[in-house]
């Protein structure tokens, strides 16, 4: 029999690289089975995890799981760190592994690496293929 | 009950590449949460993890061997494909499949029975 | 990576008597959801590994009370209260709290 605990499916270590100056979208899958849970994210600031407030947010429901979702538009150089969601459910505060984001500040990479700066780079490569992962479905 | 069972080659030629396959049952790759492990363990030698794909396709490689490997899923048959590259006598070992989840704490919670393999020419 | 040390790498027992491993990291494995992913296998002869600890101290189910996990930091032990003759075989602790996810080197449980 499937848990109706809350469950917050943001993974251990993971990681996304951005761009500063582009749209980018912070998802928290979120598993609940009535109530939809107040959810929140924060910004770690040493062992503080400090509130977002004023910052677009919005739900994305689909069949099995809810993704809420924190809005950069557009990211911004100190957009870079580490997030936590949290959920308030039945009086318990459920708090996610946090997630990075690695921003690349655009004014010192003045463009986008290119198709033969990523092969010569497999590190490039390994940061844009391997964490800057959306869900799909 | 999570069974996981590994099968490929039991001999392998140095620089061939390698293909192992660990099918599973008791669990599901579309479940969210879910991820399989590859790790392996040289004859008389410590335990080294190799690889990790979760439910979203994310997937995790140990820096040292990431240019070697690959791994994929094909949730429809339960199975988990890893490939490694450029085989050598280092890489005799018995390998084995794992399953762990994105939250840390079921890492490794279940294994197959491992499957060994020999690289030589 | 983080290097995880086991001591001693062979350990004779006395049935009935108490067995102790240490094991040790280069790097705290306290992660920064207060969380430390310190885990410890048992691998019997000719078998697959099987968890026996994890998160430093909780055991997996069907695992014997006379195991024991203990630790903080960057040093951690295992403990069996009064060792069985199935308790023999090597046993690993690896840690889940940094990348590349790493194992110690094993430590060989035998009767004296």
């Known amino acids: 029999k499937e848990s109706c605990d809350v469950q917050l499916y943001i993974k251990r270590q993971s990681e996304h690289s951005i761009l500063a100056g582009d749209p980018f979208e912070l998802e928290c899958p979120v598993k609940y089975c009535a109530n939809r849970p107040h959810v929140t994210w924060c910004k770690l600031n040493g062992t503080t995890c400090v509130k977002l407030e004023d910052r677009q947010t919005s739900w994305k429901e689909e069949k099995n799981i809810s993704f809420f979702i924190l809005h950069f538009e557009p990211v911004l150089p100190n957009d870079n760190g580490s997030y936590r969601c949290s959920a308030n459910f039945q009086s318990n505060l459920i708090e996610s592994h946090s997630t990075t984001l690695y921003v690349t500040d655009v004014k010192s990479a003045s463009e986008r690496p290119s198709k033969d700066e990523m092969a010569s780079r497999p590190w490039l490569l390994y940061r844009h293929h391997h964490h800057h992962h959306h869900h799909h479905h | 009950q999570v069974t996981l069972k590994e099968s490929g080659p039991t001999l392998v030629k140095p620089t061939q590449t390698l293909t192992l396959t660990c099918t599973f049952s008791g669990f599901s790759l579309s479940t969210f949460g879910m991820g399989v492990s590859w790790i392996r363990q040289p004859p008389g030698k410590a335990l080294e993890w190799l690889a990790h794909i979760y439910w979203d396709d994310d997937k995790r490689f140990n820096p040292s061997l990431k240019s070697r490997l690959t791994i994929t899923k094909d949730t429809s048959k339960n199975q988990v494909v890893l490939t490694m590259t450029n085989m050598d006598p280092v890489d005799t070992a018995t390998y084995y499949c794992?399953?762990?989840?994105?939250?840390?704490?079921?890492?490794?919670?279940?294994w197959g029975q491992g499957t060994l393999v020999t690289v030589s020419s | 990576d983080v290097v995880m040390t086991q001591s001693p790498l062979s350990l004779p027992v006395t049935l009935g008597q108490p067995a102790s491993i240490s094991c040790k990291s280069t790097q705290s494995l306290l992660d920064s959801d207060g969380k430390t992913y310190l885990n410890w296998l048992q691998q019997r002869p000719g078998q697959s590994p099987r968890r026996l600890i994890y998160?430093?101290?909780k055991l997996d189910s069907g695992v014997p009370d006379r195991f024991s996990g203990s630790g903080s930091g960057t040093d951690f032990t295992l403990k069996i209260s009064r060792v069985e003759a199935e308790d023999v075989g090597v046993y690993y602790c690896w840690q889940g709290t940094h990348f590349p996810w790493t194992f110690g080197q094993g430590t060989k449980v035998e009767i004296k």
């Open positions: 998160l430093v101290s």
């Open positions: 794992a399953r762990g989840n994105w939250d840390g704490e079921t890492y490794f919670d279940y």
